[in-house]
């Protein structure tokens, strides 16, 4: 047990001890999106408000033009919720010529873009087709999961039609990350 | 390198350091709900298994009274999952006079009381039309995001009807919250 | 205050400190399925990538066998989405003889064995009743929470039909769990 | 009840600027977006943008961007859109509207402020 | 770039029903918060009718009704009466989020 005695409760630690109350963290909040034009095939990202009202961000976690910016390498855990709205789907007319229509649907996904790498890297989606009967219809995806993150790299949320994303409430629709 | 010998790995810590088993956590779950009086235009709040089968409160984190107690400022990951069930939505008699009805819905909201603030706060929501066709039905809403909290604020559990809450098993509905 | 000299910043701590960075950690990702025998009353497990793509097990937290092994003890985030798709549900017939019909539904269940207790114990459970109208469909369920675990505890996800998992792509279905 | 009331009619020469003011009350200021939308003379209605006068957050149609400048003072509880570079097709009654914030339909309209831009 | 089409103008003796028409050049016209109607009398600001395809705003009479069908949205004015002359605008969102305005039109009551 030689020199263990300057030791003290912490002999098990190979990495660097860092207090959690510094580590980079972020809680994005909706905000309105401004009108802007953008590829048909290419999923429109979301902006965010990122110091008004729940929002924050903190330890060198910066949000700029759509995206979170990863100050630090590690595994961090990252999450949103995009709540969705919308008039009543055409697929409610249920069948046409006896067969099902393709139907109408939802997504988000958050992701990765890393400088270095020429194409982005979707982390997470959540999908769901919708096809509503008779009347307006809401709903939220989540999504949430820890992934190995790279100082540089940069988050992002895209959907499926930026049309449809409730904006009304900061509580609806979010996005957040933090380190591990 | 002068009077590094003395910090050995965790040089760079300006907050206090502390033990990641030593933090306020909680996770509680779905008990049979007790007929109360709530107010038309205000949903009804939970309450929680604290102690048996998965439920837990540690460190400080205590439970009381439909309410989880903050002990500690800090930042939080606070979630929740609520299963509804119910019968066959009016919404599914599809159209009256050609128009659609007002969507049937389901809400869970994640909400923030502090004592020396007036009005609640709502963290999180999660909302759905239910406008099922044919059948019982019964699905889950999940919530979860890491909020700034302060010592004393009180975390409850808010749903749009108590009724279609599902309180059959402690896995189906459940709420909980952890200091980062 | 004797001795205090040599405790500089972190004295409040009574459990050992331990560097975040090593604890362990897993995120793994869908893959194709293969044909498996289960017996009819019970939902069969999922097995997963664990080393390719997103996916990663690191710092003890080993996979095998459809399982996650928890290599020590203490308080464990646990995640899962699943993605199901599948054809229009029978359910869609809306009634027969004037009664709903029993209905379709998608189920996931994160379980926990313990090789010391007969029965498995179900932590988390996300349900729904599927009754779709007049297409495909498509759908994620996501489930979160903090649960206490002992070393050796095996985590596995069930879910009520395999044949609905959506296995094309690793951001939408995936499974994970992290020490915090 | 809610009311917009906006500020009288201006005159502006080609290449001005001329900035309208929208005065709420009846509401709470800060919890609706405010639209723009102008009408010239014997023509149909014009969306011009929309301001968010809690967080100062905006969003312009693309014809305006670079032209139109969308403020709120939440002091007093009242919107601004000032119009650059003005020319003679700008002359139209410009009007505000308050959303309702589910369907962001235009609910509470004011009375109109008619900007004529001729040399 | 989306387009709201409007008939430029529809008439109809007192009590009785028109329909004014509004049609998307494409499909997405008004998935997230629907279609809406605004009636202006000469000299006023417009007065919102109708939100949300079928809604009517509390104060505005029940003769005057919603409808959607596929890309195209109506509204239908019942028992028309002398004061319900004036310009009609149909209005929606496209998938940019601009706020679009149908060109208008023009409803006179004969007689």
């Known amino acids: 047990l030689k020199g263990q005695e300057f030791a003290p409760s912490h002999q098990q630690v190979y990495a660097p001890l860092r207090a959690d109350g510094d580590k980079p963290r972020a809680h994005l909040t909706v905000v309105r999106q401004t009108p802007t034009q953008h590829f048909k095939n290419q999923f429109p990202a979301l902006h965010w408000e990122h110091e008004l009202g729940l929002a924050f961000t903190k330890n060198r976690m910066n949000y700029t033009n759509k995206f979170l910016l990863i100050p630090e390498s590690g595994d961090y855990f990252i999450y949103s919720q995009v709540t969705f709205r919308g008039m009543t789907s055409e697929c409610s007319e249920i069948r046409q010529a006896g067969r099902p229509n393709k139907p109408d649907s939802i997504t988000v996904v958050i992701t990765k873009v890393t400088d270095s790498y020429p194409e982005p890297t979707q982390l997470l989606m959540g999908t769901k087709s919708v096809c509503e009967v008779g009347s307006n219809w809401f709903q939220p995806i989540y999504l949430g999961a820890m992934f190995s993150l790279q100082e540089g790299d940069k988050l992002m949320v895209n959907v499926s039609d930026i049309s449809l994303v409730d904006y009304t409430k900061e509580d609806k629709t979010f996005f957040g990350a933090f380190l591990l | 390198l002068k009077g590094q010998e003395f910090a050995p790995s965790h040089q760079q810590v300006y907050a206090p350091l502390r033990a990641d088993g030593d933090k306020p956590r909680a996770h509680l779950t779905v008990v049979r709900q007790t007929p109360t009086q709530h107010f038309k235009n205000q949903f009804p709040a939970l309450h929680w298994e604290h102690e048996l089968g998965l439920a837990f409160t540690k460190n400080r984190m205590n439970y009381t009274n439909k309410f989880l107690l903050i002990p500690e400022s800090g930042d939080y990951f606070i979630y929740s999952q609520v299963t509804f069930r119910g019968m066959t939505s009016e919404c599914s008699e599809i159209r009256q006079a050609g128009r659609p009805n007002k969507p049937d819905s389901i809400t869970v909201v994640i909400t923030k009381v502090t004592d020396s603030y007036p009005e609640p706060t709502q963290l999180l929501m999660g909302t759905k039309s239910v406008c099922e066709v044919g059948s019982n039905w019964f699905q889950p809403i999940y919530l979860g995001a890491m909020f700034s909290l302060q010592e004393g604020d009180k975390l409850m559990v808010n749903v749009s009807d108590i009724s279609l809450v599902d309180y059959t098993k402690e896995d189906k509905t459940f709420f909980g919250a952890f200091l980062l | 205050l004797k001795g205090q000299e040599f405790a500089p910043s972190h004295q409040q701590v009574y459990a050992p400190l331990r560097a975040d960075g090593d604890k362990p950690r897993a995120h793994l990702t869908v893959v194709r399925q293969t044909p498996t025998q289960h017996f009819k009353n019970q939902f069969p497990a999922l097995h997963w990538e664990h080393e390719l793509g997103l996916a990663f097990t690191k710092n003890r937290m080993n996979y095998t066998n459809k399982f996650l092994l928890i290599p020590e003890s203490g308080d464990y985030f646990i995640y899962s989405q699943v993605t199901f798709r599948g054809m229009t549900s029978e359910c869609s017939e809306i009634r027969q003889a004037g009664r709903p019909n029993k209905p379709d539904s998608i189920t996931v269940v994160i379980t926990k064995v313990t090789d010391s207790y007969p029965e498995p114990t179900q932590l988390l459970m996300g349900t729904k009743s599927v009754c779709e109208v007049g297409s495909n469909w498509f759908q994620p369920i996501y489930l979160g929470a903090m649960f206490s675990l002992q070393e050796g505890d095996k985590l596995m996800v069930n879910v009520s039909d395999i044949s609905l998992v959506d296995y094309t792509k690793e951001d939408k279905t995936f499974f994970g769990a992290f020490l915090l | 009840q809610v009311q917009l009331v906006q500020s009288g009619a201006e005159v502006k020469k080609p290449g001005a600027s001329v900035k309208v003011s929208c005065k709420a009350s009846g509401y709470t200021f800060t919890s609706y977006d405010i639209n723009w939308v102008r009408q010239a003379p014997g023509q149909g209605l014009e969306w011009m943008g929309w301001?968010?006068?809690?967080?100062?957050?905006?969003g312009y149609a693309q014809k305006f961007q670079g032209r139109v400048t969308m403020t709120a003072d939440r002091s007093t509880s009242t919107a601004y859109m000032e119009l650059s570079s003005l020319r003679s097709e700008d002359t139209a009654v410009y009007y505000c509207a308050r959303e309702v914030p589910e369907t962001a339909a235009f609910e509470y309209w004011g009375q109109g402020t008619l900007v004529t831009v001729s040399s | 770039q989306s387009v709201l089409t409007q008939p430029p103008s529809v008439s109809g003796a007192p009590g009785q029903r028109v329909t004014i028409s509004c049609t998307s050049s494409s499909s997405d016209i008004g998935a997230g918060q629907g279609v809406h109607w605004y009636q202006q009398l000469p000299g006023t600001a417009p007065k919102l009718l109708i939100e949300g395809y079928y809604n009517r705003p509390s104060g505005v009479p029940d003769r005057f009704s919603g409808s959607k069908s596929g890309t195209s949205a109506s509204l239908t004015i019942t028992g028309l009466l002398p004061e319900d002359e004036g310009d009609y605008y149909c209005?929606?969102?496209?998938?940019?989020?601009?706020?679009?305005f149908g060109g208008g039109t023009k409803l006179t009551v004969l007689g």
């Open positions: 301001l968010n006068p809690n967080s100062g957050n905006t």
């Open positions: 209005q929606s969102y496209d998938g940019t989020l601009s706020a679009l």
